[in-house]
Each structure stands twice: as C-alpha cells, then as structure tokens.
C-alpha cells in the first residue's frame, strides 16, 4: 500500500509535470499567433484511456515528436529550450509510471493538435492530483 510519503512524492512530481506542460502550452499560446498555424499542422496521438499513472506511457511515447515541434518555435517570442524541457518531463514520467511493469499504450482513433494534446495531459495531471489530495 502506498505510504503518505510516497503519495506526497507522487503529488509533487505530478505538480511539477503539470507546471512543465502548462509552461509549454503558455509558450505556444504566446507565440506570435496565428503563426502558430505552422505548429497546428502536426498531429499527436491521444490515449484511449488516461486514468492511471501507467497511462503516462502514452505521453512518454509522444515526447520525441513534441520536442521536434517545439524546436520549430524557436524565436525571440518563444523562450523555451525544448531539449531540456522534454528531458525533465521524461524523467518525471519515467518515475511516475514506474519501469517495472510494461504497459502497452492504446491510442484513440482521433488525433489532436499540439494544443489539444497538451490540454489533455494537463487535465490528466489535474485529475490525478485531485484524487491524491
């Protein structure tokens, strides 16, 4: 059974992940809009189900494409270092989902834009955090 200290650690990691995802979303939305349309041509794959930490496998598998799209947005209006940010997210995701159990991600039929994708995972983090508090 999870201890209060492990629950607290999970909560902090989720909050950190949430902040990182929100930072990316804010960076995109602040990026000279609608030059954003160039980024919106990219499609991302969404989880069929995202209710448990193991479902973060679906996020992990989309981190490389996310980094590639964020690299497009490098400009004086967009202060993000994609490699560092994605690396940080990857570390948190690996810790949260655990590496012992192998989970095969199932993707939904519908694909999403980068904005829809980020909003989906932000909602996931908020949902899990609310169950821990």
């Amino acid at each position: 059974a999870p201890t209060s200290s492990s629950t607290k650690k999970t909560q902090l990691q989720l909050e950190h992940l949430l902040l990182d995802l929100q930072m990316i979303l804010n960076g995109i939305n602040n990026y000279k809009n609608p030059k954003l349309t160039r980024m919106l041509t990219f499609k991302f794959y969404m989880p069929k189900k995202a209710t448990e930490l193991k479902h973060l496998q679906c996020l992990e598998e989309e981190l490389k494409p996310l980094e590639e799209v964020l690299n497009l947005a490098q400009s004086k209006n967009f202060h993000l270092r994609p490699r560092d940010l994605i690396s940080n997210i990857n570390v948190i995701v690996l810790e949260l989902k655990g590496s012992e159990t192998t989970f095969m991600c199932e993707y939904a039929d519908e694909t999403a834009t980068i904005v829809e994708f980020l909003n989906r995972w932000i909602t996931f983090c908020q949902s899990i955090i609310s169950t821990l508090t």
């Epitope: 030059k35 919106l40 041509t41 499609k43 494409p65 694909t111």
Partner: antibody, heavy 117, light 108 residues
Framework: EVQLVQSGAEVKKPGESLKISCKGS????????IGWVRQMPGRGLEWMGT????????RYSPSFQGQVTTSADKSISTAYLQWGSLRASDTAMYYC??????????WGQGTMVTVSS | SYELTQPPSVSVSPGQTARITCSGD??????AYWYQQKPGQAPVLVIY???ERPSGIPERFSGSSSGTTVTLTISGVQAEDEADYYC???????????FGGGTQLTVL
C-alpha cells in the same frame, strides 16, 4: 464577408516582368499566412510559397525558390507575387489563399497569366 | 522534395460510395486537407485535419487516416460531386506545403 480578390488577367511577352496582387478583406489580414498556388492549363495544383503579412516572413517551395518573389503590404491588406523575367512555361492560373488552422480556407478567384511571344 | 500520391481518376455511379486515397511518408505526423475543384472555379476546402468538415460542406463528405494514407470518402455520390479532388499536407518539418496530383472523380 471574408474574401480575397485578385488582380485581373495578364498577357505578357517572354522576358517581361510582372507583379500580380491579392487583396484581403473582412478579416485581420496581418495575422494569417497567404499562400500562392499555381495551376498550369489542364494540370494540378502546385504550392509555390507563403508569406506572413505582419512581418513578411516567407517560405518557398524548393521548386519555386529563386523563380518568383512574394511580398505583402499590410497597410493595404495586399499580398503580391512577382516575376523578374517571365517564360512561356509560367503560363498558368495563379491562386492566392488564406492559410488558417483549418488549412487554405479562403481562396481568391485566380489570376490567369499568359506568356506568349 | 516531398510528394503526396493520389490515383489519377475514380469512377462511381450515383448513390454509390467514392473513396479517394492520398499517400505520403509524413502523413502519420502531419494533418491532411482535401479540396474540391470544379472546372473554371477556385478550389474549395471540403475536409481539414484529416476528418473535420467545414460548415456548409454536406455530411456525405468524410475523411479518415491510417498510417501513411488518408482517405476522402463521398457517400451517396451525386452528379454535382463530379470534380477534381486534391489532398494537401506538409512535409515532416512542417515547412513546406504540398498538394497531391489530384483525382478526377467521374459520376457515371
């Protein structure tokens, strides 16, 4: 009403220069990419390039890089496509189109360019 | 340079279903868009983001995507649907847009 209105048909001789226009109305012209598309007689659509009027950021298809120039004057909501020296092979219909998050959603009526000696 | 491949022509009887495919290596990561062009007219957007239909486009037009292929489906084809159809997308970097070669839909 959101629309793009293009300049009229042109008949030119090989070697002459030309600048055709595309005027936007009914929306904030500055903040949407404008694309240019060529359609040679009886052929398909070819993407030439795009321009972002707010800062004149441009992208060209490798096939058209160096062959044409796109520009924009945001003060009069107009985009331009120009040639320094026309060839007979430039004979085609040229369309401008607005690129939004839902693709090329608004198209001009087209400008027919005929190059013949 | 990046290419999108479409069949040159598709023929279908009125009331039947027409399917037009478009293949390209970047399509698993780039959305596709479909345009209808009738003779002497400018193209009209009929499907965006693989599957979305703009307002004013009949429900019989739909889009789907699987791997490197996207498909435009016209259910219950009508005579007025006879036109050229073009898919459009971007290369893997999102820098260059490209159109497929076009498919001529003939309603028998």
């Amino acid at each position: 009403e959101v629309q793009l209105v293009q300049s009229g048909a042109e008949v030119k001789k090989p070697g002459e220069s030309l600048k055709i226009s595309c005027k936007g109305s009914g929306y904030n012209f500055d903040t949407y990419w404008i694309g240019w598309v060529r359609q040679m007689p009886g052929r398909g659509l070819e993407w030439m390039g795009t321009i972002y009027p707010a800062d004149s950021d441009t992208r060209y298809s490798p096939s058209f890089q160096g062959q044409v120039t796109t520009s924009a004057d945001k003060s009069i909501s107009t985009a331009y496509l120009q040639w320094g020296s026309l060839r007979a092979s430039d004979t085609a219909m040229y369309y401008c189109a607005r690129f939004s998050s839902s693709a090329y959603d608004i198209w001009g009526q087209g400008t027919m360019v005929t190059v013949s000696s | 340079s990046y290419e999108l491949t479409q069949p040159p022509s598709v023929s279908v009887s009125p009331g039947q279903t027409a399917r037009i495919t478009c293949s390209g290596d970047a399509l698993p990561r780039q959305f596709a868009y479909w345009y209808q062009q009738k003779p002497g007219q400018a193209p009209v957007l009929v499907i965006y983001k693989d599957t979305e239909r703009p307002s004013g486009i009949p429900e019989r037009f739909s889009g789907s995507s699987s791997g490197t292929t996207v498909t435009l489906t016209i259910s219950g084809v009508q005579a007025e649907d006879e036109a050229d159809y073009y898919c459009q997308s971007a290369d893997s970097s999102g820098t260059y847009h490209v159109f497929g070669g076009g498919t001529q839909l003939t309603v028998l």
